[in-house]
């Protein structure tokens, strides 16, 4: 990409996996790349195979072990290198020093579930995945409620500024169908960003009890 | 916001030696590796060599692999480009540039740009 432009994004799930973007205008779809892991003071490398995602846009995950192992701490330094092939040799397109603990994204929030419903409330919690014990409490959560006739983008976001994995939804309307996503972010990190937001938790509300004033 | 200025630029003899500097300023930049690019008059800027500033780690066009040798000195903040075996067709104006976190060949992948050094090799 001389005249276009170029862009190869990384993020560290905080325990074992690095999941790469690498975009360029111009490239052929069914060209052949990988991006390499370079630690500066692991014995181990990782290789894996981008693969197409959009027209000009191909992603992989280095897969770094168990998904629950701490592979990388917040000292090490990852050298990430992409990699294309040029005819019978390959041809590095990319090198970023890869600083793991500034580039984090967390795995979705999983196993949330209706801990309580009422009328006009309902309480849910949620548990964290692969998130690195480094944290302690040093996580934050955003989280949505999908209301009937509203889109997910129109759903305002309400914030939890500490380790909370659990909400009190309120001012709810009886007897209604909702849906409710979270999503976590560590504190640390220049890069750091949102995790995807988590499978959505339908739940419905009690009725209001009948003859009585909601 | 990085600052970049160049210098070491002049007028050399074909097959002579020259060493280019670059003094970065700014806030992290370690995260804003640098790349050196060149235009000849009449042409386009091109591509010569680039480097991360943790790993050292290097990229080269093929138009200079074996003459020319980028470095850094993290202490000065300082890239290097030692050219040597110069040729009249390495005659351009030599801009150092900075890139958040990735170094590209593509010059549009920099965001930086300082105001270039004149390099003239007479043969």
């Known amino acids: 990409a001389v005249n276009g432009t170029s862009q190869f994004t990384c993020f560290y799930n905080s325990r074992a996996n690095i999941s790469c973007v690498w975009s360029q205008d111009g490239a052929l779809q069914d060209t052949s790349c990988q991006v390499h892991a370079w630690p500066d003071r692991r014995r181990w490398n990782q290789t894996c195979e981008l693969l197409p995602v959009s027209q000009a846009s191909w992603a992989c995950n280095l897969i770094l072990g168990a998904p629950d192992s701490q592979k990388l701490t917040t000292v090490d330094i990852v050298t990430l290198r992409v990699l294309c092939r040029e005819g019978v040799r390959w041809r590095v397109m990319a090198i970023q020093d890869f600083k793991p603990f500034e580039n984090l994204r967390l795995m979705a929030p999983i196993s949330l579930q209706v801990v309580h419903v009422e009328t006009h409330r309902c309480n849910i919690s949620w548990e964290i995945s692969q998130a690195s014990h480094y944290f302690e409490r040093h996580l934050e959560f955003e989280a949505r409620t999908l209301s009937p006739g509203h889109t997910w983008e129109e759903a305002p976001l309400l914030t939890l500024k500490q380790k909370q994995e659990w909400i009190c939804l309120e001012t709810l309307t009886p007897d209604t169908q909702y849906e409710f996503q979270v999503r976590v972010k560590p504190l640390q990190g220049e890069f750091t960003t949102w995790s995807p937001w988590s499978q959505p938790l339908a739940f419905r509300t009690k009725p209001a009890a009948l003859g009585k004033d909601t | 916001e990085v600052q970049l200025v160049e210098s070491g630029g002049g007028l050399v003899q074909a097959g002579g030696s020259l060493r280019l500097s670059c003094a970065a300023s700014g806030r992290a930049i370690e995260n804003y590796p640098v790349g050196w690019f060149r235009q000849a008059p009449g042409k386009e800027r091109e591509f010569v060599a680039a480097?991360?500033?943790?790993?050292?780690?290097?990229l080269y066009a093929d138009s200079v692999k074996g003459r020319f040798t980028i470095s850094r000195d993290n202490a000065k903040n300082t890239v290097y480009l030692q050219m040597s075996s110069l040729k009249p067709e390495d005659t351009a104006l030599y801009y150092c540039a900075a890139a958040l976190k990735t170094i590209t060949r593509g010059q549009n992948d920099y965001s930086y740009w300082g105001q270039g050094t004149q390099v003239t090799v007479s043969s």
């Open positions: 480097i991360t500033w943790i790993s050292g780690s290097t």
